[in-house]
């Protein structure tokens, strides 16, 4: 029951996380104009991974896509790539985890197969979350660097008579959405991996021997008396199992743990 709950919760948390990663990737507010210590502009600039927007004080918003691929900064391309990889891995992970859910029955899928699928989806969620966190963090680092560079320019470029309004950018809402979503996907992945351990067939640490006793079958042959009890040092009928002291019939019925046909 705990395993099912852990797996289900892991799936739901990852689902929310991946939805968040998709939302963050599509959002326009990755960086927003810094309003602190700046003149009150009648325009508000903000930028996303795919386009930049300007919201005028009049209420009109104009967005322009980045219609160039080669002209964009390498860092931005890297962030795009990380977010897309995160989304793709997360989507595949979700697909795999749906079939791995203990509460969903698909044919005669064995628990070991479900355990493997749970582990696979868990790893995918972890990598997906890490990609999102990495992407957002790279962008945030880029912003911090540019922020201090433009701040330095603000105080060094005041020599002339004409002043220029230096537009500085700070963290946008998408960064926080991305960090939280990445974290949730990561947590969901860890939960799936924990659930996987509980789904795997239980194993004990001791070895046991089961015997096939042939009984006291006495054979009379000309030329003397020979008796074979079947309990001698003859190891032909002796079988060693790593999985508990059971008869061979019991062991064969084990894989379908709960379903006795």
């Amino acid at each position: 029951m705990a395993v099912t709950a852990c797996q289900g919760l892991g799936f739901v948390v990852s689902l929310i996380g991946i939805a968040g990663i998709i939302a963050a990737t599509c959002m326009d507010q990755w960086s927003t104009q810094d309003l602190y210590n700046n003149p009150v502009t009648a325009v508000f600039n903000y930028q996303g991974l795919w386009r930049s927007c300007v919201r005028e004080s009049s209420g009109f918003t104009e967005c322009r896509g980045y219609f160039t691929l080669l002209g964009l900064p390498a860092m931005l391309q890297a962030v795009r790539a990380l977010m897309i990889v995160g989304i793709v891995l997360g989507a595949i992970g979700l697909l795999v985890s749906i079939f791995a859910l203990k509460c969903i029955r698909i044919g005669s899928m064995e628990d070991s197969a479900k355990a493997n699928m749970t582990l696979t989806s868990g790893i995918m969620f972890i990598v997906s979350g890490l990609c999102a966190i990495a992407g957002v963090s790279v962008f945030a680092n880029m912003l911090v660097t540019n922020f201090w560079m433009s701040t330095a320019n603000m105080y060094t470029g005041m020599g002339g008579m004409v002043q220029t309004v230096q537009t500085r950018y700070t963290f946008g809402a998408a960064l926080f959405v991305g960090w939280v979503a990445g974290g949730l996907t990561l947590i969901g992945g860890v939960m799936m991996c924990i659930a996987c351990r509980g789904l795997a067939p239980e194993e004990t640490n001791y070895k046991a021997v089961s015997y096939h006793a042939s009984g006291h079958s006495v054979a009379y042959k000309p030329g003397g008396f020979k008796a074979s009890t079947g309990f001698g040092s003859n190891t032909k009928n002796k079988k060693i199992y790593d999985g508990g002291a059971r008869t061979e019939d019991e062991v064969q019925s084990y894989p379908s743990k709960h379903d006795y046909v």
Partner: antibody, heavy 118, light 113 residues
Framework: DVQLVESGGGLVQPGGSRKLSCAAS????????MHWVRQAPEKELEWVAY????????YYAHTVKGRFTISRDNPKNTLFLRMTSLGSEDTAMYYC???????????WGQGTLVTVSA | DIVMTQSPSSLTATAGEKVTMSCKSS????????????LTWYQQKPGQPPKMLIY???TRESGVPDRFAGSGSGTDFTLTISSVQAEDLAVYYC?????????FGAGTRLELK
């Protein structure tokens, strides 16, 4: 057709108060930022105050800050300017203006004249 | 506050003549986000409220005759009337539409000979 009609102007004693109104029609009033702009006789234009579509953002010119209050009633399509502690320098034609693309003042009312005199 | 300086304060032209008037701002009106200059030109005829002619420094408002053209970037802007007509007799104002307070120039009075 967009129409902006100002009212409430007139002769005011120095130190007195006045409330100007602007009735808007012909556009979705609640979607646009609005301004008051004034023009003293034979002088240039002077921006007075701005209010965003939802009244969340308000700005004033330094010369009127603390004395004037801009407000709006979206259901009634009306813009207001409450003026207090009026002085002779506030004598002007007051225009109600609609904000548009490029932060431009696209539609102007005919104006209402406020004269501050003893 | 941004100071808008217009020149000349007045100019006289004959019908059909090309006229230009200048507007300078104390700070750049160019917004880096969309590479647009937030400068607007208005025309005010005697006894009337102003009428918007050009926004974003060079975009003509619908209904404005194409003889009116705006140009310039950053801090230096120009309004050109390619062929002055009698109805163009007015005062022309430039306005900073970028930083609050939104300031106007003192105007250029266009008179006809």
């Amino acid at each position: 057709d967009v129409q902006l009609v100002e009212s409430g102007g007139g002769l005011v004693q120095p130190g007195g108060s006045r409330k100007l109104s602007c009735a808007a029609s012909g556009f979705t009033f609640s979607s646009f930022g609005m301004h008051w702009v004034r023009q003293a006789p034979e002088k240039e234009l002077e921006w007075v105050a701005y209010i965003s579509s939802g009244s969340s953002t308000i700005y004033y010119a330094h010369t009127v800050k603390g004395r004037f209050t801009i407000s709006r009633d979206n259901p009634k399509n009306t813009l207001f300017l409450r003026m207090t502690s009026l002085g002779s320098e506030d004598t002007a034609m007051y225009y109600c203006v609609r904000f548009y693309y490029g932060n431009s003042f696209v539609n102007w009312g005919q104006g209402t004249l406020v004269t501050v005199s003893a | 506050d941004i100071v808008m300086t217009q020149s000349p304060s007045s100019l006289t032209a004959t019908a059909g003549e090309k006229v230009t008037m200048s507007c300078k701002s104390s700070q750049s009106l160019l917004n880096s986000g969309n590479q647009k200059n937030y400068l607007t030109w208005y025309q005010q005829k005697p006894g009337q409220p102003p009428k918007m002619l050009i926004y974003w420094a060079s975009t003509r408002e619908s209904g404005v005759p194409d003889r009116f053209a705006g140009s310039g970037s950053g801090t230096d802007f120009t309004l050109t009337i390619s062929s002055v007509q009698a109805e163009d007799l007015a005062v022309y104002y430039c306005q900073n539409a970028y930083i609050y307070p939104l300031t106007f120039g003192a105007g250029t009075r266009l008179e006809l000979k």
